[in-house]
Interface confidence: low
């Protein structure tokens, strides 16, 4: 399973606006994230942005905004001024460096057939956004609850109204669950059209950040901004996930080699569980 996932999305409302999402699955503290286009940084690629957990971010045109989404994922908004977007056929690469245990890079691109106007992809692909999952999931729970309440009220006017207990769901939990297909589904990693069943269980969902910043004691913890659940979030076009491999710029003092990602997801609604980080020293 790759250590890094990459997802390229076209905004539904703006055909010339793209967002690159990247995340790191391995245990260890992220020391630097580099986003490039046209290939990997240093191998024909051109730097678009560099994100440092302590020193901030830098970006170069046509990057519009680079930001941390969680402790282990970033997003980069791109603005294309041209009429026909060059991004559609461009490869974007994200390199997560975790000094000195290693660095991992994966690349992704937007399929040429992407239709930003679609409200849902023509075939199931693992591109469910955290904020949308939260909104849809919570809305569904609330709607169902309200409907059920109304039903009970109409049928049993003389009985006390059952009281709804709100589910405790935090944004990190939503993030962990919503990104589940991209992070842990073997089928999705190797077949971009694999069917993913993403069940949403807000009452039981717990979080896992296997690459928590605290695993390297000398690193200051990065406080993620968290995914922004804005009402204007567009419906996503099809994206693609291209796994490259582990160990690009793998560095000294690496942890013992992975046997898989540091995040295991369970289909039975127990939510993600952290696999203990195998951290040697980076």
């Amino acid at each position: 399973t790759p250590e890094v996932w990459v997802q390229v999305q076209m905004e539904a409302t703006e055909l010339s606006s793209f967002t690159v999402h990247c995340g790191f699955l391995g245990p260890g503290s992220i020391s630097l994230v580099t986003v490039s286009w046209g290939g990997p940084d240093g191998a024909g690629g051109t730097k678009l942005a560099v994100l440092h957990p302590e020193l901030g971010t830098r970006q170069w045109a046509p990057a519009r905004q680079a930001r941390w989404e969680t402790q282990s994922s970033i997003s980069l908004a791109l603005e294309d001024s041209g009429a026909s977007s060059p991004f559609a056929n461009t490869t974007f690469c994200c390199k997560f460096a975790s000094f000195p245990e290693g660095s991992w890079e994966s690349c992704g691109s937007l399929p040429p057939s992407s239709d930003p106007g679609l409200s849902a992809p023509p075939t199931p692909v693992p591109i469910l956004r955290a904020d949308l999952a939260g909104i849809l999931g919570l809305s569904g729970v609330l709607l169902f609850g309200c409907g059920y309440l109304l039903h009970l009220l109409r049928r049993q006017k003389h009985r006390p109204t059952p009281r709804l207990q709100p589910s405790h769901t935090n944004s990190q939990a939503l993030t962990a669950q919503a990104w589940a297909p991209s992070q842990a589904s073997q089928a999705a990693l190797h077949d971009p059209y694999a069917t993913i069943n993403t069940s949403f269980c807000p009452a039981t969902l717990d979080t896992a950040h296997p690459n928590g910043w605290a695993s390297l004691p000398t690193h200051a913890a990065h406080q993620p901004q968290g995914p922004a659940a804005s009402a204007s979030t567009p419906i996503l076009a099809r994206g693609s996930f291209v796994s490259v491999e582990n160990g690009l710029y793998t560095q000294a003092g690496e942890r013992p080699p992975h046997t898989g990602p540091g995040l295991t997801l369970f289909p039975d609604c127990r939510g993600p569980r952290a696999v203990e980080g195998r951290f040697g020293v980076r």
Partner: antibody, heavy 115, light 107 residues
Framework: EVQLQESGGGSVKPGGSLQLSCAAS????????MSWIRQSPEKKLEWVAE????????YYPDTVTGRFTISRDNAKNTLYLEMSSLRSEDTAMYYC????????WGQGTLVTVSA | DVVMTQSHKFVSTSVGGRVSITCKAS??????VAWYQQKPGQSPKLLIY???YRFTGVPDRFTGSGSGTDFTLTINGVQAEDLAVYSC?????????FGGGTKLEIK
Amino acid sequence: EVQLQESGGGSVKPGGSLQLSCAASGFTFSSYGMSWIRQSPEKKLEWVAEISSGGTYTYYPDTVTGRFTISRDNAKNTLYLEMSSLRSEDTAMYYCARGDPFGYWGQGTLVTVSA
Amino acid sequence: DVVMTQSHKFVSTSVGGRVSITCKASQDVMTAVAWYQQKPGQSPKLLIYSTSYRFTGVPDRFTGSGSGTDFTLTINGVQAEDLAVYSCQQHYSTPRTFGGGTKLEIK
């Protein structure tokens, strides 16, 4: 214990070729990126090549691009550096190293390019 | 390419003393700088990475500091076995580049 052992060095005439090998042990070779670094007789260190864990990506500085080729055989836990069109300025001690920054180095193999 | 410059070829101190070795990058490399120690007849060994983090087994008398373009390796309580050449390296961008090295001499 991480161990890296270079071999294949020797004397060669300008324009000649040489292949260096680096046998790795003590860690899961296929999980890590590897590099070659050289040290000139003046003791100046220069990174000359890097390869990703699966061999998909290779990186070189301009000084050796087109002349040097880094490769690896993960089944044999071995890293290679194929050097061609050698020049006198390629004379150096060549080290293989794991990672970046380079946490583990071999003992080096000497390459001498001289007429 | 990022040029790493170590302006002092030699530094000298007595056993038990303190010495600082400096390195300057030609452009901002954030905190992506490593320090290596190379004793006579040996291959280099990583001491410090990412400016200030000690590598496995490195004594705490070795400390690194700096950010941006100016970096320092400090050795407190210098021991006789610290006689070596110390080189900096940036691991911020490709190609990775090294400083010319600074030799520590013991008085």
